[in-house]
């Protein structure tokens, strides 16, 4: 059997690090046995079978110039085998980032904080930590770890399914190559990554009668799950056509009227979803609507739909401590917003 | 020579923008994480932002967040700092820093001095 | 984020002192622990390297120790050139984050 540990890599391949001494190893010859070496396609004998050294070559402070196919001899001139020298570095440890779109999955994603110029793999898994009791800062025993499935196609992504919101994760990267590995541990809050997708479907309608009126109506992100305890709050911008500022509300549900739209000018309308209770961050903005209000006279009936708006809410601190979760309460696509509206409008 | 030379700094009115520099040279600059570390007048110094050797991932400390955007053009071994809605704290020398991997800085520029004041 | 703090915040010594400069974290952050020295006017320069490795080039008389939580860095013989602020910097977290840095001045 060769001498010569296989690393992890391609047969045939030995590694090294720039500056380092470097030893290669005859695959072919007995542990021990002595070798000459030379550079493949070059007469010039490198280190001869008296070198004391047996089957091995030592490069002392190897530099680039080194890399390449080497060639190993026995004392009777059968060729003991070929090696390809690659120099490169170890491992450094990789950049993590992890994020969630709902409340029961993440997905972890990574990049190599200094390229090694090697072969390279990513081991991935996570472990479950949870918290002994509201008060307490103890944590039961990890459970786990379990791999973190990576995506096919090779990409720098790993999800974990079936997560619980209320639980902390610690994930598990390591980056491999043949000189080594090195591991980022990042622990992760669901509560703290989480984001949601944007809210889907916005359309713009006018009022008719109403000629500083918009309705704008939305739906939830196809990602979130349909659960009646985890539901979504909402911000709602707006601007006239050329004008640079945009307007912001707090919608209750999943409609709004705009009450103080520009008579005759289009409007840019967009909405941002977020965990009701503030856990995580705002999602990004939905593509933006556009719709201009109506023109004409007012009818006699006031219509009752959407909150009416005339300056814009506080935005909620982010860091906000959560208040506890209500055990149940309705879906937001079970409500009917404009039951619950205040039956009252201002005229345009 | 290995350096790093920063450039872009000045001075600017509050709620304004900047963009900084980093031009890096005497190394391989697409094999390594860099970094924006500032130092106002004084004062010690404080992690900005860093970003990976691909460009696909970036970190920002709380107090730039939302503000301030970092950058690499590989092709050109250079590192950007995008600086908006600049506030009177942001005044600080700011230093390009190197890596080894993610955190360590074997490598400084020597800084540009960036003012915001009205 | 993760808090450093170093003690003494600055200190006076004669040349040929051993001088001992402590550094804590707020949590473990194992030998991810770095130490860089400052010269007025100057960039930082990296001397330690994860808690206990000298940086390529740095004099053997700088040295660190240390893990955990708690690190020391050490001076073994301060020279006149050592005139500096000296400041940790953890790196276990992604965001790093500095000590206050500790000043150094010959006596």
């Known amino acids: 059997s060769s001498p010569c540990p296989q690393a992890w890599g391609p047969p045939g391949v030995q590694y090294g690090q720039p500056g380092r001494s470097v030893k290669l190893c005859c695959p072919g010859v007995t542990a021990g046995d002595p070798v000459s070496w030379f550079r493949d396609g070059e007469p010039k004998l490198l280190q001869g079978p008296d070198s004391g050294l047996g089957h091995e070559l030592v490069l002392a402070q190897a530099d680039s110039t080194d890399e390449g196919t080497y060639i190993c001899q026995t004392l009777d001139g059968a060729l003991g085998g070929t090696v390809t020298l690659q120099l490169g570095y170890p491992p450094a440890r990789p950049v993590v980032s992890c994020q969630a779109a709902d409340y029961e999955n993440f997905s972890c994603t990574w990049s190599p904080s200094q390229i090694s110029g090697l072969p390279t793999r990513y081991l991935t898994s996570y472990r479950k930590k949870t918290v002994l009791g509201a008060d307490s800062q103890r944590r039961s025993p990890s459970t786990g770890p379990w791999p973190c499935p990576q995506d096919p196609l090779g990409a720098a992504r790993c999800v974990v399914h079936g997560a619980e919101f209320w639980s902390q994760y610690r994930i598990n990267v390591t980056e491999v190559n043949p000189l080594g590995a090195s591991t980022r541990l990042l622990d992760v809050s669901l509560q703290s990554i989480l984001r949601p997708d944007p809210p889907q479907g916005l359309r713009v309608e006018s009022v008719p009668g109403y000629p500083r009126r918009l309705r704008a109506s939305w739906t939830y992100p196809a990602s979130w799950p349909c659960q009646p305890h985890f539901l979504l709050k909402f911000r709602l911008q707006y601007r006239p056509a050329q004008h640079p500022a945009w307007s912001t509300v707090e919608p209750a549900g999943l409609e709004e009227v705009i009450t103080d739209a520009v008579a005759g000018l289009p409007h840019a309308v967009r909405v941002s979803a977020r965990d009701f209770l503030d856990a995580g961050t705002w999602s990004t903005w939905s593509p933006e609507a556009w719709g201009t209000p109506s023109t004409g006279t007012i009818p006699k009936e006031i219509p009752a739909w959407g909150q009416l708006h005339t300056q814009p809410e506080v935005e909620p601190q982010v860091d906000s401590p959560a208040p506890p979760r209500p055990s149940l309460q309705p879906h937001p696509r079970l409500l009917d917003h404009r039951d619950s509206v205040e039956q009252v409008a201002v005229l345009a | 020579e290995v350096q790093l030379l920063e450039s872009g700094g000045g001075l600017v009115q509050p709620g304004g923008s900047l963009r900084l520099s980093c031009a890096a040279s005497g190394f391989t600059f697409s094999f390594y994480s860099m970094t924006w570390v500032r130092q106002a007048p004084g004062k010690g110094l404080e992690w900005v932002s860093s970003i990976v050797p691909y460009g696909d991932l970036t970190q920002y400390a709380d107090s730039v967040k939302g503000r301030f955007t970092i950058s690499r053009d590989n092709s050109k071994n250079t590192l950007y700092l995008q600086m908006n809605s600049l506030r009177a704290e942001d005044t600080a020398v700011y230093y390009c820093a190197k890596g080894p991997g993610w955190g360590s800085f074997d490598l400084w520029g020597r800084g540009t001095l960036v003012t915001v004041s009205s | 984020d993760i808090q450093m703090t170093q003690s003494p915040s600055s200190l006076s010594a004669s040349v040929g002192d051993r001088v001992t400069i402590t550094c804590q974290a707020s949590q473990d952050i194992n030998n991810y622990l770095n130490w860089y020295q400052q010269k007025p006017g100057k960039a930082p320069k990296l001397l330690i390297y994860d808690a206990s490795n000298l940086q390529t080039g740095v004099p053997s008389r700088f040295s660190g120790s240390g893990s955990g939580t708690d690190f020391t860095f050490t001076i073994s013989s301060l020279q006149p050139e050592d005139i500096a602020t000296y400041y940790c910097?953890?790196?276990?977290?992604?965001?790093?984050?500095f000590g206050p840095g500790t000043k150094v001045d010959i006596k």
């Open positions: 910097q953890q790196h276990e977290s992604q965001s790093p984050t």
